[in-house]
């Protein structure tokens, strides 16, 4: 593929780039060509060093396309004003740490100046710590250099985990790239993709990541690989003793006829079991419900209303033909 390279390619000021970096800003990673005339898959001649091939440089998966970039495969460096492992977190100015210094017009808080570790200058998973003058990178095994940018690891060392395919990296001066199998990510395929975080199971199904596959454990009334099918909850479900089936929320419910209860209306219900008659009223089971015979001085369907001494009741009015003390039918 075409590539414009100025005469000073491979130089940064007057300093030559350290292998495997080349290019005007020492940002292009190259490795020896696999054959005199062509480069391997995804690789191309790395001008101006025609005996090398350039590996495609890809940032860490998830690195923000707006606020992140990379200079080593698998890293994510943040542009000014952004932070976090994937450069998705704005540098906060909202917490007031000190009364001194310049303040933000919007919050009145101190705006911290850029620290030497902002944007994490340490590549390849190195951790950054501030020093009095600058910063220091603590590099993971297999990396070294000021910013952990130099890899001493080759494909021969098997740096790709979880069945990742290693490309490039024939010698310690060249970069390698891990092509991860489905379900894994990271510069060394070391991170399992939490596929359940995408909530693939619908209708409240429980997601199970089995490694080789995703499984959904569906709630009652739902089916399908992603619990996408809403089953007819009442299909084939009979409610006994004249009860009617009611669908709802992935489970069927029976609305039972009077005198019956339970999930399928198979249990004979004693309407008096709950002691519905207040103030010592006596309960009688009746074909249409229950009847309360109220103790003297009380009236109402559940004997809940006292009868006043002068004969007036607390009810607005007794229904015609119904005297205080008569049994009250509770429907």
């Amino acid at each position: 593929y075409p590539y414009d390279v100025p005469d000073y390619a491979g130089m940064l000021g007057s300093a030559r780039c350290e292998p495997p970096a080349v290019g005007t800003a020492c940002t292009r990673l190259c490795r020896p060509r696999s054959a005199p005339s062509r480069c391997g898959p995804g690789l191309r001649p790395c001008a101006p060093l025609e005996d090398e091939c350039e590996a495609p440089l890809v940032c860490r998966a998830g690195c923000s396309p707006e606020h992140g970039f990379c200079e080593q495969p698998g890293e994510c460096r943040c542009l000014e004003g952004w932070t976090g492992p994937l450069c998705t977190v704005p540098v906060s100015t909202s917490s007031c740490l000190s009364p001194r210094g310049p303040s933000s017009a919007t919050t009145g808080c101190l705006v911290p100046g850029p620290g030497p570790c902002d944007g994490n200058p340490c590549a390849n998973g190195g951790s950054c710590s501030e020093t009095p003058r600058s910063f220091e990178c603590t590099c993971p095994r297999g990396f070294y250099g000021l910013r952990c940018e130099v890899s001493g690891v080759t494909c021969a060392d098997g740096p790709c985990f979880n069945g990742g395919l290693c490309v490039g990296g024939a010698d310690p001066d060249s970069a390698y790239i891990c092509h991860c199998p489905p379900g894994f990510q990271g510069s060394n395929c070391e991170k399992r993709v939490d596929r359940c975080s995408l909530q693939p199971c619908r209708n409240g199904g429980l997601c199970l990541d089995l490694g080789h596959a995703l499984r959904c454990r569906c709630r009652a009334g739902f089916a399908g690989p992603r619990c996408e099918h809403d089953l007819d909850d009442c299909a084939g479900r009979a409610c006994a003793n004249g009860g009617t089936c009611v669908e709802g929320g992935g489970a069927h419910r029976c609305s039972c006829a009077l005198g019956f209860g339970g999930r399928d209306c198979r249990e004979r219900a004693d309407p008096c079991a709950a002691r519905p008659c207040a103030h010592g009223g006596r309960c009688y089971a009746h074909f249409s419900g229950l009847v309360c015979a109220c103790a003297p001085g009380y009236m109402g369907a559940r004997c809940e209303f006292p009868v006043h001494p002068d004969g007036a009741s607390a009810l607005p009015a007794a229904p015609p033909g119904l005297r205080p003390g008569d049994p009250q039918r509770y429907l």
């Epitope: 593929y1 590539y3 414009d4 100025p6 290019g23 005007t24 800003a25 940002t27 292009r28 898959p41 995804g42 191309r44 495609p56 440089l57 890809v58 940032c59 998966a61 998830g62 690195c63 923000s64 396309p65 707006e66 606020h67 992140g68 970039f69 990379c70 200079e71 495969p73 460096r77 542009l79 000014e80 092509h179 991860c180 990510q185 993709v193 995408l198």
Partner: antibody, heavy 120, light 107 residues
Framework: QITLKESGPTLVKPTQTLTLTCTFS??????????VGWIRQPPGKALEWLAL???????RYSPSLQTRLTITKDTPKNQVVLTMTNMDPVDTATYYC????????????WGRGTLVTVSS | EIVLTQSPATLSLSPGERATLSCRAS??????LAWYQQKPGQAPRLLIY???YRATGIPARFSGSGSGTDFTLTISSLEPEDFAVYYC?????????FGQGTRLEIK
Amino acid sequence: QITLKESGPTLVKPTQTLTLTCTFSGFSLSTRGVGVGWIRQPPGKALEWLALIYWNDDKRYSPSLQTRLTITKDTPKNQVVLTMTNMDPVDTATYYCARSNWGNWYFALWGRGTLVTVSS
Amino acid sequence: EIVLTQSPATLSLSPGERATLSCRASQSVSSYLAWYQQKPGQAPRLLIYDAFYRATGIPARFSGSGSGTDFTLTISSLEPEDFAVYYCQHRSNWPITFGQGTRLEIK
């Protein structure tokens, strides 16, 4: 607030050279990691990537159009210029410029596009 | 170069329905695939990058999945403003390529 805006002729004749300018604000091409690219879209058709240029003057071109394309930047003016030689009616398209960060070869921020018609 | 094939070419659905769009790569692109939305007369807008990360300001009803060669964009419950053309794009190596697009239209 980042903005990108394309400008250039709306009509060019076959065999002529097209020169398009992308003027942007809210970021600088002197910032490490930042780049600007061009993408085109013929009427009713799909997007096609053309070229990219980065802060370090690294340039990338579409292989199918490499011989006809040149991308340059004017950092102080916040501009990127694309030239395309030997225009043909099939090059009639809306041309977009968009920002893309180094190693993160997606296009997160786009201009509104400019329609270029190639006709005699 | 990697060829991205999108299917279906056109998808006709109603608001509130679930949309599933597919993008297939001619060779593995790992998880380095993005989805864009384009409405008539507008520039494309980045929706999803690296297979399933949502871009800034994109509603949660948009989700992406897949890796290797097969990818899916899902819109869980379609809103009227979601009817547009959707493109996929890979960044696994040079040259960058886009799919031919899927038009999502109101039924």
